[in-house]
């Protein structure tokens, strides 16, 4: 699956009401300094395909973000905007209904969600050139 | 499905480096998030490093700053560069591919690395 068929707007749109929001309640009490992050998207798909391995898949230090406010409501937005998303997610939905873990915001959880506010912040200026 | 065949372990004194690579065959390579885990003699398998398709790395802090993820989608390969190795290094590592949509993963069959003097 790719992205390139998304309505991106919408989901700028959904970011900017909502998911951005949730992102900052769930990064409370961390300086914006904190995690020196230079993550980067060179194209609105690719942005997205990012944001979906970030959000919805463990990395090292950070098991899950896939039960957060901001993580069911990035992927209600891709499931509504981005044609045939939804068909991607059978299998991982069922492995998370046998997954049910106590929810631990770790430091590197917040590093990571960190990472994701950097891809948002990207996906939403889809004309600023790399650098 | 990506199948996948570690190689570049080997026995290496403390404070030494090793790269460990990792090939991988058939489709998804490119879009998969890959992982690198380990597991010491006793103890259960953890993940060590992890890098998207575009590049974004995570590490444990037991390896940050020692040990390096990279990834080569034109050659289909993973790589970990392992720098100032440690006795507490020594383990079996295991790269490994997951479809960032299903969550389905495959495993290699993983490389020894041993550090001693």
């Known amino acids: 699956y790719d992205f390139t068929n998304c309505d991106f707007e919408k989901i700028k749109a959904a970011y900017l009401s909502t998911i951005s929001k949730d992102l900052i309640t769930y990064m409370s009490g961390t300086k914006s300094t904190e995690f020196n992050n230079t993550v980067s998207c060179s194209n609105r798909p690719h942005c997205l395909t990012e944001i979906q391995s970030l959000t919805f898949n463990p990395t090292a230090g950070c098991a899950s973000l896939a039960k957060e406010m901001f993580a069911m409501k990035t992927k209600a937005a891709l499931a509504i905007w981005c044609p045939g998303y939804s068909e991607t997610q059978i299998n991982a939905t069922q492995a998370m209904k046998k997954r049910r873990k106590r929810k631990v915001t770790t430091n590197k959880c917040l590093e990571q969600v960190s990472q994701l506010q950097g891809l948002w912040r990207r996906f939403n200026r889809p004309l600023l050139k790399q650098q | 499905d990506v199948q996948l065949v570690e190689s570049g372990g080997g026995v290496v004194q403390p404070g030494g480096s090793l790269r460990l690579s990792c090939a991988a065959s058939?489709?998804?390579?490119?879009?998969?998030?890959l992982y690198w885990y380990r597991q010491a003699p006793g103890k259960q398998r953890e993940l060590i490093a992890s890098?998207?398709?575009?590049?974004?790395?995570n590490y444990v802090d037991s390896v940050k700053g020692r040990f390096t993820i990279s990834r080569d989608n034109s050659k289909n390969t993973l790589y970990l560069q392992m720098n100032s190795l440690r006795p507490e290094d020594t383990a079996l590592y295991y790269c490994?591919?997951?479809?960032?949509?299903?969550?389905?993963?495959?495993w290699g069959q993983g490389t020894l690395v041993t550090v001693s003097s």
């Open positions: 490994a591919s997951r479809n960032i949509f299903d969550g389905t993963t495959e």
């Open positions: 890098i998207t398709s575009g590049g974004i790395t």
């Open positions: 058939g489709s998804g390579f490119g879009v998969n998030i």
